[in-house]
């Protein structure tokens, strides 16, 4: 869920009050605050549905809620791509779609959502507790992955509500430098605000509502989301073909279209180092990867001189790392 926030406009201090030093310490915090507030987190949602007509047939739908342009989508099962998951399809917005059994039909539904039909016949057919994951590589956000599976008790023809994914993974591949600066800036901002706590507050003037008002994205899960997030871990039966992970099974919720927020902790790491942090209270995994990705094997989404998003598989022309397209 996104909320709009209005940042109060700062009234310039009276000339000569604090001099150049005061001016700097007053302007910088607000610049940083604006940066922090506008650094929104994209979201990925995943839906898994078993077809009523064919009990071993699944439809997976995934979407990306972010402002960036999508450069590659990878759908996998058995866990996140690159963490034991098996790639089922790779969709590149311009290079095309590649899919592998048991995927039957992968397609773009809109510019930011895809669907994949899996047919179940033989050893590679999915089963009801299989985890399906969708990874969206976008610029400038980086790579975001969310996973979901059908509740064990799902009736055929029904879908798992798109509650927050059991496994949330963010490859914060977008500009490491910017992320670092933002992180440092936000910390510094907090430090400055604490220092100014005991000083007379500058006069604030509420800003007029304007299209430029920065947006703050707050993560406020719906009741359905919260219910799903509090489900304890359940060990998945590994009798199904793909290797599966221990993951929470989200149970029912009102909206088929609820989004799966992929909020991630920004923890400095080496490029391509994955940190899986279990959050038992929420019953979900959050993984973060920091690193510059060059679109592997792919044409970099036009990122401007000197910056290449690198998911490897020619990603579509894919990204370095699990997943690849051209």
């Amino acid at each position: 869920m996104r909320t709009e926030a209005q940042v109060p406009a700062l009234q310039p201090p009276e000339p000569g009050l604090e001099g150049a030093m005061g001016h700097r310490t007053l302007v910088l915090p607000w610049v940083l605050l604006t940066l922090c507030v506008t650094a929104g987190t994209p979201e990925v949602w995943v839906q898994v549905r078993m077809e009523a007509t064919e009990l071993s047939s699944f439809t997976i739908r995934c979407g990306f809620l972010g402002s960036g342009s999508i450069s590659l989508v990878t759908v996998s099962w058995g866990g996140p791509n690159g963490a034991g998951g098996t790639t089922l399809a790779v969709l590149h917005p311009e290079r095309g779609i590649r899919q592998w059994a048991p995927a039957r039909q992968a397609r773009w539904e809109t510019q930011s959502s895809i669907s994949l039909i899996l047919e179940g016949s033989g050893a590679s057919s999915p089963c009801a507790n299989t985890t399906f994951c969708c990874k969206f590589a976008s610029f400038p956000e980086g790579s975001w992955e969310a996973c979901g599976s059908l509740p064990p008790s799902s009736d055929p023809g029904l879908s798992a509500p798109p509650t927050p994914a059991p496994i949330l993974r963010a490859d914060l591949a977008g500009i490491l430098g910017v992320s670092g600066v933002l992180l440092f800036g936000c910390v510094y901002l907090l430090h400055l605000l604490r220092r100014h706590k005991h000083r007379p507050a500058p006069r604030l003037q509420p800003s007029r509502t304007s299209p430029q008002a920065p947006r703050a994205r707050a993560w406020a899960p719906s009741q359905a989301s919260q219910a799903a997030l509090h489900v304890p871990y359940a060990t998945i039966n590994t009798s199904c073909r793909p290797a599966t992970l221990d993951t929470a099974h989200p149970h029912g919720g009102p909206s088929w279209w609820a989004s799966l927020p992929t909020h991630a902790a920004h923890r400095p790491q080496g490029p391509a180092a994955w940190a899986s942090t279990p959050i038992p209270a929420r019953g979900s995994f959050v993984s973060v990867e920091n690193g510059l990705y060059a679109q592997a094997g792919e044409r970099p989404p036009h990122t401007g001189p000197g910056l290449t998003l690198f998911p490897d598989p020619r990603g579509p022309r894919a990204m370095e790392g699990p997943l690849g397209v051209r």
């Epitope: 098996t86 917005p93 290079r95 592998w100 510019q111 997943l323 051209r326």
Partner: antibody, heavy 114, light 113 residues
Framework: QAQLQQPGAELVKPGASVKMSCKAS????????ITWVKQRPGQGLEWIGD????????NYNEKFKNKATLTVDTSSSTAYMQLSSLTSEDSAVYYC???????WGTGTTVTVSS | DIVMTQSPSSLSVSAGEKVTMSCKSS????????????LAWYQQKPGQPPKLLIY???TRESGVPDRFTGSGSGTDFTLTISSVQAEDLAVYYC?????????FGSGTKLEIK
């Protein structure tokens, strides 16, 4: 720099089989699929099939389903294509390509002759 | 299978001239979901493997000179070389990147006078 290395030539007898290799380097092998393409002398390009090293699952052009078998060895970052029951029609240059055909191997010339 | 038809089969031009070649597909290569055309163009010089020039009907692969331009939508596509250079001597192929099997056109051979 991504590269695909293929042996230059294979001479085989009619009815026999040949297994050609495509060794990948300079990128994460399991992150991109490998596609195989056939080109007969002086003719166009034909898509044979592709295989994704991350799941070992191949796709085939129906025309080549009983002719080609695609496999990969992730430990050596090598893709293989085996052609069986060879005839003169199979004499051609066979290319492997990475992902969305952004990097191509140099090609293996297969000559079927008794 | 989608059939790709290229024309002309060959053409001969002088260096500096503009050249246009056509590619028609038997089915639309437009992806209705994201409104992208899944068509690619390749250049194959004598004795070399093909090289990707254009994807998505109009996006140049990195490193490809801007004299190469792809256009078109649906079933009709065009590759234009604004000012032919001697090194452009090659066969140019279009390819269906839309659906399996990924078929190629028969090629247009470009000769330099």
């Amino acid at each position: 720099q991504a590269q695909l290395q293929q042996p230059g030539a294979e001479l085989v007898k009619p009815g026999a089989s040949v297994k050609m290799s495509c060794k990948a380097s300079g990128y994460t092998f399991t992150s991109y699929w490998i596609t195989w393409v056939k080109q007969r002398p002086g003719q166009g390009l034909e898509w044979i099939g592709d295989i994704y090293p991350g799941n070992f699952s191949p796709n085939y052009n129906e025309k080549f389903k009983n002719k080609a078998t695609l496999t990969v060895d992730t430990s050596s970052s090598t893709a293989y294509m085996q052609l069986s029951s060879l005839t003169s029609e199979d004499s051609a240059v066979y290319y492997c390509a990475k992902g969305y055909f952004d990097v191509w191997g140099t090609g293996t010339t297969v000559t079927v002759s008794s | 299978d989608i059939v790709m038809t290229q024309s002309p089969s060959s053409l001969s031009v002088s260096a500096g001239e503009k050249v246009t070649m056509s590619c028609k597909s038997s089915q639309s290569l437009l992806n209705s979901g994201n409104q992208k055309n899944y068509l690619a163009w390749y250049q194959q010089k004598p004795g070399q493997p093909p090289k990707l020039l254009i994807y998505g009907a109009s996006t140049r692969e990195s490193g490809v000179p801007d004299r190469f331009t792809g256009s078109g939508s649906g079933t009709d596509f065009t590759l234009t070389i604004s000012s032919v250079q001697a090194e452009d001597l090659a066969v140019y192929y279009c390819q269906n990147d839309h659906s399996y099997p990924f078929t190629f056109g028969s090629g247009t051979k470009l000769e330099i006078k």
